[in-house]
Amino acid sequence: YNNFRKSMDSIGKKQYQVQHGSCSYTFLLPEMDNCRSSSSPYVSNAVQRDAPLEYDDSVQRLQVLENIMENNTQWLMKLENYIQDNMKKEMVEIQQNAVQNQTAVMIEIGTNLLNQTAEQTRKLTDVEAQVLNQTTRLELQLLEHSLSTNKLEKQILDQTSEINKLQDKNSFLEKKVLAMEDKHIIQLQSIKEEKDQLQVLVSKQNSIIEELEKKIVTATVNNSVLQKQQHDLMETVNNLLTMMSTSNSAKDPTVAKEEQISFRDCAEVFKSGHTTNGIYTLTFPNSTEEIKAYCDMEAGGGGWTIIQRREDGSVDFQRTWKEYKVGFGNPSGEYWLGNEFVSQLTNQQRYVLKIHLKDWEGNEAYSLYEHFYLSSEELNYRIHLKGLTGTAGKISSISQPGNDFSTKDGDNDKCICKCSQMLTGGWWFDACGPSNLNGMYYPQRQNTNKFNGIKWYYWKGSGYSLKATTMMIRPADF
């Protein structure tokens, strides 16, 4: 049997001992000083790093590696010579002392030595590859450094020229500003002169307006007697209609929905304990037809049914007769509740109408009519108003007596022209009259000198288009 053992002697030489039968063979191999063993801390993978080493450090390491390679090469040559010499000596000894069957042992030893040699060669190849790898990396790094240096130089040059250009531009602009300042002073002087002239004109116009207003007040007084007679008559008719509808509904038990509470208006919603602003479902009087409306449960005691809202121009108000009849838009935003519902509701009992207005300068105003109702569709949803109070003008901006409702496809105004087409939106136009809250929505700084805007003449004049409007109704006895 064979026993092959590898150990180190006291001097540090590698010692190979082979036991075969009664014979024992020992080989002593020289150990190179500069040649590190595989257990050395300088392992092969230490050369390959993800981040390249600093340049000087790399150069040093390269030199170390070159030395190691040279030493390894020398050591290999010595090893070959050593093996050959030993082999010759051993062969002679074996031939002299050993029997023929010792040949096998010698072959085994030779094989082991060759394996050792191959192992060393492989290690060298590894080191060589690593050196090449590192060299390539360093070359690339150097190339990158030089490229980035070039790039930085170019950028500096570009920036320098850019700075020069900007300096030129700056001085040019400075000159221009000075010239403009001179021009501006001249313009200001001419504007001041114009302003003085305009003030004279305005004062003249004010006196004319005052005279006209006096005439209008006189005309209004003359009209009020006729209006009172008409409204008293209408009130009597309304009372009769209410009495008739009450007796009819008493006979018709199907009107009341057992399973669901229904509300005629926001005042009923409020009285049922729902005192939060929001959208609620309302039921048409004497019908199961439903509509959703926004209820203002806070302003002036709450219970207000919003019948119109303008706030941002998001909804087109240039609509057909049918659309104004049934309503359009969204109760949470801009909308028109619908003439049919409002007509039916306001003919059931006495309602007040409040119109709330906002201008673009942060001012607010309102007009409150103590009695409001709309005629039926057959009478073109004519508006009826009585008893004006509020801060949006002493005179009603909805012409008195009330006019029929007009739309782009339903012209019922008192003008040869078609007011709805000309001023846009559906409204109770006269010829064409001092108001239109359903006109074109104009944004800030575009809202003046607009004949077709959102107009309330006796608050902001004829050409001013308002920022926001809300029309709301509530029972007079709320």
Partner: antibody, heavy 119, light 107 residues
Framework: QVQLVESGGGLVKPGGSLRLSCAAS????????MYWIRQAPGKGLEWVST????????YYPDSVKGRFTISRDNAKNSLYLQMNSLRAEDTAVYYC????????????WGQGTLVTVSS | DIQMTQSPSSLSASVGDRVTITCKAS??????VAWYQQKPGKAPKLLIY???TRHTGVPSRFSGSGSGTDFTLTISSLQPEDFATYYC?????????FGQGTKVEIK
């Protein structure tokens, strides 16, 4: 753009419960009444429930009253339908829908979620 | 509740045909009727509301008419994409109720 996405459907045994959800986006959820509408396989559309903007008013047909509960969470832009005591005839695709504003015609619908009630 | 009865329940037609679907309400609903189109596996799509107002983006070949209790949806010239099921719905009062549907098939 307006989007309604239903979830929570699945297979459930008769007498069991299920909670459907509808995630809304692309509009101010708290400005609109919301609806559940269902469609049994091969059948027509049937309204199931309505909820008002604030959730104080809810409406149901007799077929689901007392078993189904509609609710909403305006902070989470979500609509829910809690379905209890489920029956085989409740098997349907359940759609969440939004109306136009003033009247209940349905402009926006979800893709639907299938509820199967079977033993 | 208001019942909505649609007729016919199904019909066969060819591309280019004029198709008429009717819907009858159990009580007067004024003009508060909407029409929807539904294709298999999809949610319904609004076509018409207030009996005759076309919803945004709906082709002009679709038209609606009627008031009171009798309503009609007309497709003037049937297109390949129009083969679907059509539903009427009243939006007059709660609960909103639908017709049973009309399936338009290829002849």
């Amino acid at each position: 753009q307006v989007q309604l996405v239903e979830s929570g459907g699945g297979l459930v045994k008769p007498g069991g419960s299920l909670r459907l959800s509808c995630a809304a986006s692309g509009f101010t959820f708290s400005d609109y009444y919301m609806y559940w509408i269902r469609q049994a396989p091969g059948k027509g559309l049937e309204w199931v429930s309505t909820i008002s903007v604030g959730g104080s008013f809810t409406y149901y047909p007799d077929s689901v009253k007392g078993r189904f509960t509609i609710s909403r969470d305006n902070a989470k832009n979500s609509l829910y339908l809690q379905m209890n005591s489920l029956r085989a005839e409740d098997t349907a695709v359940y759609y969440c829908a939004r109306d136009w504003g003033l009247r209940p015609w349905f402009v926006y619908w979800g893709q639907g979620t299938l509820v199967t009630v079977s033993s | 509740d208001i019942q909505m009865t649609q007729s016919p329940s199904s019909l066969s037609a060819s591309v280019g045909d004029r198709v008429t679907i009717t819907c009858k309400a159990s009580q007067d609903v004024s003009t508060a009727v909407a029409w929807y189109q539904q294709k298999p596996g999809k949610a319904p799509k609004l076509l018409i509301y207030w009996a005759s107002t076309r919803h945004t983006g709906v082709p002009s070949r679709f038209s609606g008419s009627g008031s009171g209790t009798d309503f009609t949806l007309t497709i003037s010239s049937l297109q390949p994409e129009d083969f679907a099921t059509y539903y009427c719905q009243q939006h007059y009062s709660t609960p909103p109720t639908f017709g049973q549907g009309t399936k338009v098939e290829i002849k």
